[in-house]
């Protein structure tokens, strides 16, 4: 699988889309998970509805969500309130029974908010009463990783 | 009508190479999965694996893996099951089946082909 | 691997005869399960998917119930049609998928 990238800004949120095959993959429940190192473990983040048919719905888990598009293929995934601490390296998933397919390696960056020299007065935030869902999503910058690029840096 | 069509029955000797198919027709091919069963004389279903021609994704049993090819062309929708050097242990009847959709999310393994009877004999 | 569990082997009963046949699964398969019938010299035929929802076409005194590690394939009345073997076949991974080891129903 090559790895494609998203960029987000700090504070804002992050839109990931994973096209896939609706046919090769009917019936199958999605999942989002952060790779932990190189070849380590895929850590599951969040899933979608145990009930394939209400795959639609959006799934919380903490600051990330997941929703299926089951008929059209395409799995979203919004990762609110980017962090620095949110930039690495993800996967979408295909679950069945005990195997996970990989739908799309994804490397998230997360860019400084070029804003953020600015009082927090002149920043706008959701309230306690306002929904999420009619907030501004940032589109997502992405790109396929080149040739030779890789994902984790080096260790020394 | 959906279905699936074997190719008819071989008789081989141990050693040689076999290649037998699997057409499928009434429906789009490459959006289903494939799957191979083996039925020795008088015995029970075996799993060998699926394949999804759509893009070749491939899936074996790991009691076949490495002694059968399971293949597709989908420019003339079939599926294909091989052996490099047949043995008298894979004188069976070979199904092919596809994995059906349904509306609720489900699958099964819905249309059967009439399967290929094969004997490996010196 | 995952082992499906079919009993009994042979079942021996009589055309009206309620008729039941299990399948257990050695770890939880949810309810991706099927059940097939096979008469000698023919492909199997789909009879119950997702462990209970009844195939198109297929005589409504079958039915199939359970889900995890235990499932049941019941003949509410046995009719001519119906001596054949019976195979439970697992679906809920494709490496590998599992069949029974069948139930081959014959005449008392």
């Known amino acids: 699988h090559n790895t494609t990238v998203f960029q987000g800004v700090a504070g804002q949120s992050l839109q990931v889309s994973c096209p896939y095959d609706s046919m090769k993959h009917w019936g199958r429940r999605k999942a989002w998970c952060r790779q932990l190192g190189e070849k380590g473990p895929c850590q599951r983040v969040v899933s979608t509805h145990n009930l394939w048919l209400l795959s639609f719905l959006r799934r919380w888990n903490g600051s990330t969500a997941i929703t299926d598009d089951t008929l059209g293929g395409t799995l979203t995934i919004t990762l609110r309130n980017l962090q620095p601490h949110d930039a690495g390296l993800y996967q979408c998933q295909s679950l069945h029974g005990s195997e996970a397919d990989t739908l799309r390696k994804v490397l998230v960056e997360v860019l400084a908010d070029p804003l953020d020299h600015r009082d927090a007065g002149d920043l706008w935030f959701p309230g306690e009463s306002e929904s999420f869902e009619d907030a501004h999503v940032e589109h997502s910058i992405s790109r396929s990783l080149l040739e030779g690029e890789i994902p984790f840096p080096p260790t020394s | 009508e959906v279905q699936l069509v074997q190719s008819g029955a071989e008789v081989k000797k141990p050693g040689e190479s076999l290649k037998i198919s699997c057409k499928g027709s009434g429906y789009s091919f490459t959006s289903y999965w494939i799957g191979w069963v083996r039925q020795m004389p008088g015995k029970g279903l075996e799993w060998m694996g699926i394949i999804y021609p759509g893009d070749s994704d491939t899936r074996y049993s790991p009691s076949f893996q490495g002694q059968v090819t399971i293949s597709a062309d989908k420019s003339i929708s079939t599926a294909y099951l091989q052996w490099s050097s047949l043995k008298a242990s894979d004188t069976a009847m070979y199904y092919c089946?596809?994995?059906?959709?349904?509306?609720?999310?489900?699958?099964?393994?819905?249309?059967w082909g009439q399967g290929t009877m094969v004997t490996v004999s010196s | 691997d995952i082992q499906m569990t079919q009993s009994p082997s042979t079942l021996s009963a009589s055309v009206g005869d309620r008729v039941t046949i299990t399948c257990r699964a050695s770890?939880?398969?949810?309810?991706?399960l099927a059940w097939y019938q096979q008469k000698p010299g023919k492909a199997p035929k789909l009879l119950i998917y997702?462990?209970?929802s009844l195939e198109s076409g297929v005589p409504s005194r079958f039915s199939g119930s359970g889900s995890g590690t235990e499932f049941t394939l019941t003949i509410s009345s046995l009719q001519p049609d119906d001596f054949a073997t019976y195979y439970c076949?697992?679906?809920?991974?494709?490496?590998?998928?599992?069949f029974g080891g069948g139930t081959k129903v014959e005449i008392k």
């Open positions: 997702d462990a209970s």
């Open positions: 089946a596809r994995l059906g959709i349904y509306s609720t999310g489900a699958t099964a393994f819905d249309i």
């Open positions: 076949l697992d679906y809920n991974s494709y490496s590998p998928i599992t």
């Open positions: 770890q939880s398969i949810s309810s991706w």
